[in-house]
Interface confidence: medium
């Protein structure tokens, strides 16, 4: 089995308030089995942004069809960005279990929010 890598190619993304932000994340292996989750921030204070297995997350949509078994693209789009959305977003693979356990994280993408153009 190929070792799982989680690739967040963008170190930073800048978006105007009110626009949508696309945060890219791809994985290189389907193993181990388990969901992908997105968080803003690291450590105990991090905030769940998207969980493949639960929801809804009204402002978050996946860029590709994540329900397809062979899907390796877990990029997300967050709509109607506000300054409160600024931060570092991590795409994290969990290993299936009871409960699911964190397996590997991407390096993170920093989202900055520009003022809405007048």
């Amino acid at each position: 089995e190929e070792e799982l890598q989680i690739i967040q190619p963008d170190k930073s993304v800048s978006v105007a308030a009110g626009e949508s932000a696309i945060l890219h994340c791809t994985i290189t292996s389907l193993f181990p089995v388990g969901p992908i989750q997105w968080f803003r921030g690291a450590g105990p204070a991090r905030v769940l942004i998207y969980n493949q297995r639960q929801g809804p997350f009204p402002r978050v949509t996946t860029v590709s069809e994540t329900t397809k078994r062979e899907n390796m693209d877990f990029s997300i789009s967050i709509s109607n960005i506000t300054p409160a959305d600024a931060g570092t977003y991590y795409c994290i693979k969990f290993r299936k279990g009871s409960p699911d356990t964190e397996f590997k994280s991407g390096a993170g993408t920093e989202l900055s929010v520009r003022a809405k153009p007048s």
């Epitope: 690291a42 450590g43 900055s112």
Partner: antibody, heavy 119, light 108 residues
Framework: DVQLVESGGGVVRPGESLRLSCAAS????????MNWVRQAPGEGLEWVSL????????YYADSVKGRFTISRDNSKNTLYLQMNSLRAEDTAVYYC????????????WGLGALVTVSS | ETVLTQSPGTLTLSPGERTTLTCRAS??????LAWYQEKPGQAPRLLIY???SRATGIPDRFSGSGSGTEFTLTISSLQSEDFAVYYC??????????FGGGTKVEIK
């Protein structure tokens, strides 16, 4: 070859200002995030500030926030650090460091510029 | 912020010896860890990134390992030019980017 050359260091009194420059060559400057890292005499390395390639994303260490300003001029391939309200504890060698294109480690460093704050 | 603790603070060794330096993180940084070498009057030099990948031009006597919170840098056979200070740096939890306090490898 990648080259980073710092300049502008010197001796100042507490409360005074100084501006450091870092001239970059050997790579597409505007495509890379840049950082300042410092080292006080006899101490370890301390990250000071980073600026994204476009200049839109900027971060500072808490110890310098509100006093230091990082900026860049991509047309001149130059990184700057404006240091105001200097304190004795800011005395250090200040290094300009280029980030890798994918991750936040530093693949190239300058030789550093010595800043001494003393009354 | 993630705190990195390096040990020991100083190592006194002879050329040809094998040595292992340790870096511990206060929370998991996965494999987002780099090692640097610093000598007086020289620019710090990247040795290892991704916990175990050697940077361009780094001799294979340098190797890194570890993940999560525990990392090591091993120098298999010390050469005279390896006597220096070594720092680890995490780039998972950022900013701030944080460095360990350093380990000085000095000649016996």
């Amino acid at each position: 070859d990648v080259q980073l050359v710092e300049s502008g260091g010197g001796v100042v009194r507490p409360g005074e200002s100084l501006r450091l420059s870092c001239a970059a060559s050997g790579f597409t400057f505007s495509s890379y995030d840049m950082n300042w890292v410092r080292q006080a005499p006899g101490e370890g390395l301390e990250w000071v500030s980073l600026i994204s390639g476009s200049g839109e994303i900027i971060y500072y260490a808490d110890s310098v926030k509100g006093r230091f300003t990082i900026s860049r001029d991509n047309s001149k391939n130059t990184l700057y650090l404006q240091m105001n309200s200097l304190r004795a504890e800011d005395t250090a060698v200040y290094y300009c460091a280029k980030e890798d294109n994918r991750y936040r480690f530093f693949d190239y460093w300058g030789l550093g510029a010595l800043v001494t704050v003393s009354s | 912020e993630t705190v990195l603790t390096q040990s020991p603070g100083t190592l006194t060794l002879s050329p040809g010896e094998r040595t292992t330096l340790t870096c511990r993180a206060s929370q998991s940084v996965y494999t987002y860890l780099a090692w640097y070498q610093e000598k007086p009057g020289q620019a710090p030099r990247l040795l290892i990134y991704g916990a175990s990948s050697r940077a361009t031009g780094i001799p294979d006597r340098f190797s890194g390992s570890g993940s999560g919170t525990e990392f090591t840098l091993t120098i298999s056979s010390l050469q005279s030019e390896d006597f220096a200070v070594y720092y680890c740096q995490q780039y998972y939890d950022r900013p701030p980017l944080t460095f360990g306090g350093g380990t000085k490898v000095e000649i016996k």
